[in-house]
C-alpha cells in the first residue's frame, strides 16, 4: 500500500524525505524562513499528513505563503515611508518611521527603520517591536528672533510665530458674584503642559491659604497673536492645575505652577514648546540678555487708577516683547531692601531690567517666560517666569522686574509632568 510521490511546496520542504511512503508513514510539511504553511486559508507553522491504508494521502500538500506584517502601526506625530516598491509589507520588507519635523524629533535619535520579521512583526534593531517616540522639539521658533530689540513697556509687536510657546491663561472664577476674571501668561513645555507663575492660578480666596483655582475656571490659548482675534488660536481647558506646594503668597517665593491641558495640542509653526534649563542653582548669569513677551500693559504712562477704571482696555491687543538684561542678585536685593515695604528677593528669584527704567514687564504679563538663547544647543530656554515688581509704575527707574528662577525647579517640573528626565533628555537644554 504505497502512497504517491510527494512534491514539497514552493518555499517549503517535507520531512522525512523518502523515495517511497507506505501505510502509516507520516510527513511534516514546513516552510522556509519568512513563509507560513497555508491550509484551507488557515496559517500554521507546520502541517502533518499520513499515508492511508488505501494508498492515498490524508490531505493535499498545503502551500507556503510569504509572511505579511500587514500595515504598520500609526506613529503619533510621525510619518511612515516604505523602502520597498509597491509598499510591500511582506517578509524582509522595510519601512521607515520619521517624526513631523521640525516640530517633533525621534527619541534617542533612533533610525526609525523597521523590517518585517519571519514572525510577521515589524522589528527595529534597538526597540524591537515597540514603536519609536516622537517628542516635541523645543526652543526653536519657526521664525528667528531679531537680534536687536528696543524695548512690554517700551516693547515691540511680536510677529506671529516668534514666541510659539507663549500661552494666554484666562481665569474666570464663576463661584463669586459677580464673576471674577483675570489673566496671565504661560509657556508651553510639551503638547500637554503649560508652565506659569503660581500667583496667576491661586484662587482669589478670603484667607492666606494657597489653593489653586478650580480647573473648570481656566482656559489656555496657544498660537495667539492678537487678543481681538482668537479664531486662529488653539484653546484648551485644564485637566489639572498644580501650584508649587511651597508657594508663599506673602513674598512670592516658589512662584511656579503647571497646567495640564485637557487634550494635547497639535504643534506647528505658531505652537511649539520652549526648552527647560539644566538644574542649576545659579540661574542665568548677570548681564545675560533675555526676551519676555506678554499682552500686559504696554503704556508706561498709564496709572493704576486708569487701569482700574478702563478695565482691560489698557491691555495690548498684539503680543509685545522686550529684551532685558539679568541684573546681579546683590544689586537687585539692595534696590528692593532700600524701599519701604517688606520686599524679599530670595535665591529662587532673579531680577531683570535697566537701571534707567523704560523697559519692563507689567501687570498682566505674569507667568510669562523669560527666555535666553543657549548657544550650545541653539535653542531658547525658559530661565524665568514673570513674578512681581516694585510698587512704583512699571518701567520706573531702578525698579527691576522679579522673575522665578526656573532652573531651581526642573526636577519638580519633570516630576509633575510624570516624565523621568532620561526619557525627555532631548527636550532639555544640551
Amino acid at each position: 500500500n504505497e502512497c504517491p510521490e510527494l512534491q514539497p511546496p514552493v518555499h517549503g520542504k517535507i520531512e522525512p524525505s523518502q523515495a517511497k511512503y507506505f501505510f502509516k508513514d507520516q510527513v511534516l510539511v514546513s516552510c522556509d524562513t519568512g513563509y507560513k504553511v497555508l491550509k484551507d486559508n488557515v496559517e500554521m507553522d507546520t502541517f502533518q499528513i499520513e499515508c492511508l491504508k488505501d494508498g492515498t494521502w490524508s490531505n493535499k500538500i498545503p502551500t507556503c505563503k510569504i509572511v505579511d506584517c500587514r500595515a504598520p502601526g500609526e506613529l503619533e506625530h510621525g510619518l511612515i515611508t516604505f523602502s520597498t516598491r509597491n509598499n510591500l509589507t511582506t517578509y524582509k520588507s522595510e519601512i521607515k518611521y520619521s517624526c513631523q519635523e521640525p516640530y517633533y524629533k525621534m527619541l534617542n535619535n533612533n533610525t526609525g527603520i523597521y523590517t518585517c520579521s519571519a514572525q510577521g512583526v515589524w522589528m527595529n534593531k534597538v526597540l524591537g517591536r515597540s514603536l519609536p517616540t516622537c517628542l516635541p522639539e523645543c526652543g526653536q521658533p519657526s521664525r528667528s528672533l531679531p537680534s536687536l530689540v528696543k524695548r512690554i513697556i517700551g516693547g515691540r509687536n511680536a510677529e506671529p510665530g516668534l514666541f510659539p510657546w507663549q500661552a494666554l491663561i484666562v481665569v474666570e472664577d464663576t463661584s463669586r458674584v459677580p464673576n471674577d476674571k483675570w489673566f496671565g501668561s504661560g509657556a508651553l513645555l510639551s503638547a500637554s503642559w503649560i508652565l506659569t507663575a503660581a500667583h496667576v492660578l491661586r484662587s482669589q480666596r478670603r484667607d492666606t491659604t494657597v489653593i489653586p483655582v478650580s480647573k473648570e475656571h481656566v482656559t489656555v490659548y496657544l498660537g495667539l497673536h492678537d487678543v481681538r482675534d482668537k479664531s486662529g488660536a488653539v484653546n484648551s481647558s485644564a485637566a489639572r492645575v498644580v501650584l508649587h506646594p511651597d508657594f508663599n503668597i506673602q513674598n512670592y517665593n516658589h512662584d511656579i505652577a503647571l497646567v495640564q491641558l485637557q487634550e494635547p495640542v497639535p504643534l506647528g509653526p505658531h505652537v511649539m514648546p520652549v526648552c527647560l534649563p539644566r538644574l542649576e542653582p545659579e540661574g542665568p548669569a548677570p548681564h545675560m540678555l533675555g526676551l519676555v513677551a506678554g499682552w500686559g500693559i504696554s503704556n508706561p504712562n498709564v496709572t493704576v487708577d486708569e487701569i482700574i477704571s478702563s478695565g482691560t482696555r489698557t491691555l495690548s491687543d498684539v503680543l509685545q516683547y522686550v529684551k532685558l538684561p539679568v541684573v546681579p542678585h546683590a544689586e537687585c536685593k539692595t534696590s528692593y531692601e532700600s524701599r519701604s515695604g517688606n520686599y524679599s528677593v530670595t535665591e529662587n528669584m532673579f531680577c531683570a531690567g535697566y537701571y534707567e527704567g523704560g523697559k519692563d514687564t507689567c501687570l498682566g504679563d505674569s507667568g510669562g517666560a523669560f527666555v535666553i538663547f543657549d548657544d550650545l544647543s541653539q535653542r531658547w530656554v525658559v530661565q524665568g517666569l514673570v513674578s512681581w515688581g516694585g510698587p512704583e509704575e512699571c518701567g520706573s527707574k531702578q525698579v527691576y522686574g522679579v522673575y522665578t528662577k526656573v532652573s531651581n525647579y526642573v526636577d519638580w517640573v519633570w516630576e509633575q509632568m510624570g516624565l523621568p528626565q532620561s526619557v525627555v533628555e532631548p527636550q532639555v537644554e544640551r
Partner: antibody
C-alpha cells in the same frame, strides 16, 4: 429669579446649639459661595464665614472658627449654619447671602436662659 | 483682619442734596491680578436685609438708581448719593472682600 429662604426664628438656652437653614433657588446652587452674616439688635453687620456647596470648601472668620460649622445639601439646594456653645451675645439676626448680591430674609436667634 | 472705618457715623441731608459717605480700609483692597478693588456698598432699611448697591468700588448693581455712585481705590472709598430721595433713608455699610470680609460700622442717612 434668585431667592434665598431661611428657616424660622429660634429661641435657645446658653450652651446649646442652633442650626439655621437657607434654601436657594433660581441658580446653580453648587457653583456659588454662600456667606453667613449676623446682626445683633441695633448693631452693625458681622461676617461669620462662607461655604462653596459644590466642593464643601469653607472659610471662617477667626472669631467663629471652631464654633460655627457650615454644611450644604446639594440635593435640596440648602445650606446650613450651625453655631454651638451659644451665649447671650449671640442673639442676632442671622443672614445667608449668595456671594455678595442676594440676601435671605434673616433668621432671629434669641439666646436666653 | 482688615479694619473698615466709615465716616461720618450719621448724616442728615436735605432732599435733593448730595450725600457723601467715606470708607477707609486698613490696607489696600486693590488686587493687582484682577485690577479690581474688592469693596462693596450696601443699603439697609429697618427690618429688611441689606441690599447690594455697588461692587468693585464703582460698579453699580443692576436695578440700582444712577444717583448712587461709588469711587476710590486702594484704601479710600466714597459712596455718593447725588440727589437724596426720601426712600434713601437707611443705614449704609461698606464691606471689603479682598480678604476675610469685614464691614464698616455703618452710616445712618436721614433727611434734614
Amino acid at each position: 429669579q434668585v431667592q434665598l429662604v431661611q428657616s424660622g426664628a429660634e429661641v435657645k438656652k446658653p450652651g446649646a446649639s442652633v442650626k439655621v437653614s437657607c434654601k436657594a433657588s433660581g441658580y446653580t446652587f453648587t457653583g456659588k459661595w454662600i456667606e453667613w452674616v449676623r446682626q445683633a439688635p441695633g448693631q452693625g453687620l458681622e461676617w461669620i464665614g462662607e461655604i462653596l456647596p459644590g466642593t464643601g470648601s469653607t472659610n471662617y472668620a477667626q472669631k467663629f472658627q471652631g464654633r460655627a460649622t457650615f454644611t450644604a445639601d446639594s440635593s435640596t439646594s440648602t445650606a446650613y449654619m450651625e453655631l454651638s456653645s451659644l451665649r447671650s451675645e449671640d442673639t442676632a439676626v442671622y443672614y445667608c447671602l449668595r456671594s455678595e448680591d442676594v440676601w435671605g430674609q434673616g433668621t432671629l436667634v434669641t439666646v436666653s436662659s | 483682619d482688615i479694619v473698615m472705618t466709615q465716616s461720618p457715623d450719621s448724616l442728615a441731608v436735605s432732599l435733593g442734596e448730595r450725600a457723601t459717605i467715606n470708607c477707609k480700609s486698613s490696607q489696600s483692597l486693590l488686587a493687582s491680578r484682577t485690577r479690581k478693588n474688592y469693596l462693596a456698598w450696601y443699603q439697609q432699611k429697618p427690618g429688611q436685609p441689606p441690599k447690594l448697591l455697588i461692587y468693585w468700588a464703582s460698579t453699580r448693581e443692576s436695578g440700582v438708581p444712577d444717583r448712587f455712585s461709588g469711587s476710590g481705590s486702594g484704601t479710600d472709598f466714597t459712596l455718593t448719593i447725588s440727589s437724596l430721595q426720601a426712600e434713601d433713608v437707611a443705614v449704609y455699610y461698606c464691606k471689603q472682600s479682598y480678604n476675610i470680609p469685614t464691614f464698616g460700622q455703618g452710616t445712618k442717612v436721614e433727611i434734614k
